[in-house]
Interface confidence: low
């Protein structure tokens, strides 16, 4: 019968001919009367056989990631009779893995959005690298993830590639972060290969800023001839948030005379001071009112940022108008 052990060839061998192993017939007494032949895909090009001894050699560098096994056939013939000594037999040469492939991130580019001020531990995104090496061969394809850029705001779980927040971030200070993740095979041991990817993490806005008046005092004037409903002037607050979180409503906080009103221009986010009752210079030539500003939408859990509404003082001077029939001699 045929005698052989399992055949293995390490991939990427640099030797011009690598001894794979030996197949022989147990009838072979070593007197050179038997001739061994190799058949099948790869015979003669990738693998050759010493016809006298049955020793098999690989004469090409092999790449396991391209082809991991070769199925060949062996024959043995008695030279003196020309007959087969054994029935033709099939055997397998396996290409064993070396760590020659670095991890690759396949889903690039990575981008994630997370609310600012998210607590530590909040999941941002999972990055996944794959390694073309053999997962069943040692640690060649066992990956460990680490953070190259992104501390102290982010962390990555070493075995899963899950990126989490490790420190609260304020969008108003910085609204996006580039995180760089490295995946290393060989579970990070010496000889490991690595791949890297960049993750763009954008912070979405939460309403953690209240609107604040630009000025603590505004001076406006109104003509005593102005009809009710007249726009006297505008006041303005700023809000470091964006979008809906920066929408604001202006209102009167204090106007003992009940002469003025404030409406909000939602397009410009300005407060418009309106004359509610006609004024009379001879009766009262100046007024002092206080206005306040609040965000339009505030979630319950964010109320702590909005406790004290910003206020401003508005001084309104009434302009005298010569009245018909007035004045005498």
């Amino acid at each position: 019968g045929w005698v052989w052990n399992q055949f293995f060839v390490p991939e990427e061998m640099n030797t011009t001919s690598h001894h794979v192993g030996r197949l022989r017939s147990d009838l072979d007494n070593g007197n050179n009367s038997f001739q061994y032949k190799l058949l099948g895909a790869g015979a003669g090009s990738t693998f050759i056989i010493d016809e006298r001894t049955g020793d098999i050699y690989a004469i090409e560098k092999l790449d396991r990631e391209e082809r991991s096994l070769y199925i060949l056939r062996a024959q043995v013939i008695d030279i003196t009779t020309g007959r087969a000594v054994e029935p033709e037999s099939e055997f397998v040469i396996k290409v064993s893995d070396i760590n020659d492939n670095e991890p690759k991130f396949l889903d690039e580019p990575y981008e994630a959005i997370v609310p600012e001020m998210s607590p530590e531990g909040t999941l941002v995104i999972q990055v996944t690298a794959s390694d073309a090496d053999d997962p069943s061969s040692g640690n060649n394809a066992r990956l460990l993830y680490s953070l190259l850029q992104g501390q102290p705001y982010f962390s990555v779980e070493p075995t899963t590639g899950v990126i989490r927040i490790s420190s609260k971030m304020d969008r108003e200070l910085q609204d996006e972060y580039w995180v760089i993740i490295q995946a290393k095979d060989m579970i990070g041991q010496p000889g490991a290969l690595s791949g890297t990817t960049s993750v763009l993490i954008k912070l979405s806005d939460v309403n953690d800023n209240k609107p604040i008046f630009k000025e603590s005092l505004y001076r406006l004037t109104v003509s005593e001839s102005a009809p009710t409903g007249t726009s006297i002037g505008t006041i303005m607050a700023y809000d470091n948030d964006i979008g809906e979180n920066a929408e604001m409503d202006y209102s009167i906080e204090e106007d003992d005379s009940q002469t003025f009103d404030i409406i909000t221009n939602h397009e410009t986010q300005e407060g418009i001071v309106i004359l509610k009752k006609k004024v009379n210079f001879e009766h009262q030539n100046h007024y002092g009112i206080r206005a306040k500003v609040k965000n339009h939408h505030v979630d319950e859990q964010l109320m702590k940022y909005h406790t004290e509404a910003s206020t401003t003082f508005i001084k309104i001077q009434v302009e005298d108008v010569d009245e018909p029939g007035g004045g005498g001699s």
């Epitope: 190259l148 850029q149 760089i180 290969l193 690595s194 890297t196």
Partner: antibody
Framework: QVQLVQSGAEVKKPGASVKVSCKAS????????MSWVRQAPGQGLEWMGI????????TYAQKFQGRVTMTRDTSTSTVYMELSSLRSEDTAVYYC?????????????WGQGTLVTVSS | QSVLTQPPSASGTPGQRVTISCSGS????????VNWYQQLPGTAPKLLIY???QRPSGVPDRFSGSKSGTSASLAISGLQSEDEADYYC???????????FGGGTKLTVLS
Amino acid sequence: QVQLVQSGAEVKKPGASVKVSCKASGYTFTSYYMSWVRQAPGQGLEWMGIIHPSGGDTTYAQKFQGRVTMTRDTSTSTVYMELSSLRSEDTAVYYCARGGIKLWLHFDYWGQGTLVTVSS
Amino acid sequence: QSVLTQPPSASGTPGQRVTISCSGSRSNIGSNFVNWYQQLPGTAPKLLIYTNNQRPSGVPDRFSGSKSGTSASLAISGLQSEDEADYYCAVYDESLQGWVFGGGTKLTVLS
């Protein structure tokens, strides 16, 4: 926008020292490393060393160890590079270059360069 | 002698694709990101490619970078006359605990 503005050209005698400044603006000065890179006439780029403006920690290239000193002034967002015991082969354009928030990350902005000529 | 090896010169005609190589070792290219800089005559270097293959805003997508093992390359497709410059690769070296530059490649655009 980020800007690095370096001091003007210098002519020095062999054995003297030179101190080049690099004023940064348009970003948080203390968050990013700053490197110094030089280029002799007709030659390639040569890294000299790096400083982290936050703590002032420095790492110098082996070749310049003992001759180069990098410092910073956070109040003016300025880094300085002083090279002593000058010799004619130190004639070069000296650049400051902003690094990343980690030592091994790229230089994204460069100063305009300062020509230092060493001649007797 | 630079730690990173680049060809001293490269050339191509307008519209062509050229590749510039940068060869290092496990302690530099094998362990860290490769960056490429373009230096136009009489100007300071400019970041062209960072973290192996990323382009800063404003850099045309004609420029691309790649890295494999201990070597890296910069490819320029659709070559233009304004690409005539010196190109440098740079990487942080773990053994030297410092940055290393390639010797630079002078790219000539032939008319």
